[in-house]
């Protein structure tokens, strides 16, 4: 806390300008009117205040707006944003995407701080859902943002937002998140034709069920091995050798290099060796000829 002291004669600030960097902390407290500061917040960023001086300016704003800053002030906080605590930010009502962008810019290049996480949470909750423009903005600043959300939070993502998602935005998503995002992507891209559709849906296929992989295998999509390796093991296991061959097209040869890794390894174990031999890749580990295969999962479903 800065002690309350009278402003020395002639030092009362008429506007926010560079002369204030020579003020001591107590002089800033005494001589800068909080209302003036609020109306001229856009100037603060251009002035090289010390961290201690920024603390004083924040204190003045806190006193002026005990219930939380108005958006007109928030939009121009600049580096003062770094002084805010998550508790401060929870009092805000940020509705403008421009305000969000301005504050994210301040933190650019750094990990997502608790302040930024709180700001984003407030913004998204205020909007009611994660719309396309917001998602576009957030993934531009934080490519891993989407994968930081819980499956429950992802469920409120409207399909139109999926158009903003780039393949790298999904790199850190786990299967539970892709399970939620994949149906959204299917909805979003449903008006596209075969080849265009596959290009767009490819990044989300880690959430695809067996039925969809079977349907895709009929479309001559030529899935690459990197995509195939990201598919859900439980979705790949029921695929026949012929279906995998159709799904991968010319990339089927890559199975040999991946035969010890999931899901390829587990899939091989489920196939008849005779069927695997038809690929001519030397894949080993299939069910020997003459053995009976009991699908217990199917039996459970029927009982």
């Amino acid at each position: 806390e800065v002690e309350k002291t009278a402003c020395p004669s002639g030092k009362k600030a008429r506007e926010i300008d560079e002369s204030l960097i020579f003020y001591k902390k107590w002089e800033l407290e005494a001589c800068v009117d909080a209302a003036l500061l609020a109306t001229q917040m856009d100037r603060v960023n251009a002035i090289p205040f010390t961290y201690e001086q920024l603390d004083v300016l924040k204190h003045k704003l806190d006193e002026l707006y005990p219930q939380g800053y108005p958006e007109s002030v928030i939009q121009h906080l600049g580096y003062l944003f770094l002084k805010m605590s998550p508790e401060d930010i929870r009092k805000w009502n940020v509705t403008s995407l421009e305000t969000l962008k301005a504050l994210l810019e301040v933190n650019k290049g750094h990990e997502m701080s608790p302040q930024v996480a709180t700001l984003i949470d407030r913004f998204v909750k205020g909007r009611g859902q994660l719309d396309k423009d917001t998602l576009d903005t957030l993934t531009a600043f934080y490519p891993g943002y989407l994968c930081s959300l819980s499956p429950e939070e992802l469920s409120s993502v409207p399909p139109s937002s999926i158009w903003a998602v780039r393949p790298q935005d999904l790199d850190t998503c786990d299967p539970r998140q892709l399970d939620v995002l994949y149906p959204k992507a299917r909805l979003a891209f449903q008006n596209m034709n075969g080849s265009e559709y596959f290009v767009k849906i490819q990044s989300f296929l880690g959430g695809a069920p067996t039925e969809d992989l079977k349907a895709l295998s009929q479309q001559n999509v030529s899935m690459d091995l990197a995509t195939f390796m990201k598919l859900r093991t439980d979705a790949v296991l029921p695929l026949t050798v012929a279906e995998v061959q159709k799904l991968l097209g010319p990339h089927v040869e890559g199975l040999k290099a991946e035969e010890r890794h999931r899901p390829v390894r587990d899939w091989i174990l489920r196939q008849r060796q005779d069927d695997l031999d038809t690929l001519g890749l030397g894949l080993q580990g299939g069910i020997p000829n003459g053995y009976l295969v009991l699908d217990l999962s199917m039996q459970e479903a029927l009982s």
Partner: antibody
């Protein structure tokens, strides 16, 4: 033949909630997307939302956002649609419909329930 | 919000061809579906993805979609085809149904 069997008619007071169920008979596998569509008396069809086969992903029409919740019990092959804060304008027949037609990017509704009349009246 | 407009009614003589239009901004860039609904019954899908017929739907039902208009054609119309017909398409985050057309077989 595959059928979707819906719960019976409901009469509700304004402000209350209603939960309509839709059970698949003749096919116990939870492999299809399920839509909910409503039709007010003498009016056209209005889409409310969709739930995916595993029940983890839902998409709701903007108009119903915050008021509708769709859930799925895969053990009983039943889908539920709950609508809260009911008003008189919500009086309608509510249909569930499945997308079973073949197609990798297709959600056409080709199997429909018989409909559930929900009347909202004080 | 996206809108699909249909004529309120279309009349056709038995054995003749009925054409029902559905207009919407750049509708040809989207896939259109068509549903038939008879009084007191649930809707029935008759056309999906512009021109594909589900199994069990008679060949006399066909569809097309280009520009701003999708069209459902019923050739050799029968008395049993008398019903309301709704077009439908996906736009942005919702399925939009057309305003509906009552087909009367004279």
């Amino acid at each position: 033949e595959v059928q979707l069997v819906q719960s019976g008619a409901e009469v509700k007071k304004p402000g209350a909630s209603v939960k309509v169920s839709c059970k698949a008979s003749g096919d116990t596998f939870n492999r299809y997307y399920v839509h909910w569509v409503r039709q007010a008396p003498g009016q056209g069809l209005e889409w409310m939302g969709i739930i995916n086969p595993s029940g983890v992903s839902t998409t709701y029409a903007q108009k119903f956002q915050g008021r509708v919740t769709m859930t799925r019990d895969t053990s009983t092959s039943t889908v539920y649609m709950e609508l809260s804060s009911l008003r008189s304008e919500d009086t309608a027949v509510y249909y569930c419909a499945e997308s079973r037609v073949p197609g990798y990017n297709n959600f056409a509704m080709d199997v429909w329930g018989q409909g559930t009349l929900v009347t909202v009246s004080s | 919000s996206y809108e699909l407009t249909q004529p309120p009614s279309v009349s056709v003589s038995p054995g003749q061809t009925a054409s029902i239009t559905c207009s919407g901004d750049k509708l040809g860039d989207k896939y259109a579906s068509w549903y038939q609904q008879k009084p007191g019954q649930s809707p029935v899908l008759v056309i999906y993805q512009d021109n594909r017929r589900p199994s069990g739907i008679p060949e006399r039902f066909s569809g097309s979609n280009s520009g701003n208009t999708a069209t459902l054609t019923i050739s050799g119309t029968q008395a049993m085809d008398e019903a309301d017909y709704y077009c439908q398409a996906w736009d942005s985050d919702t399925y939009v149904f057309g305003t509906g057309t009552k087909v009367t077989v004279l």
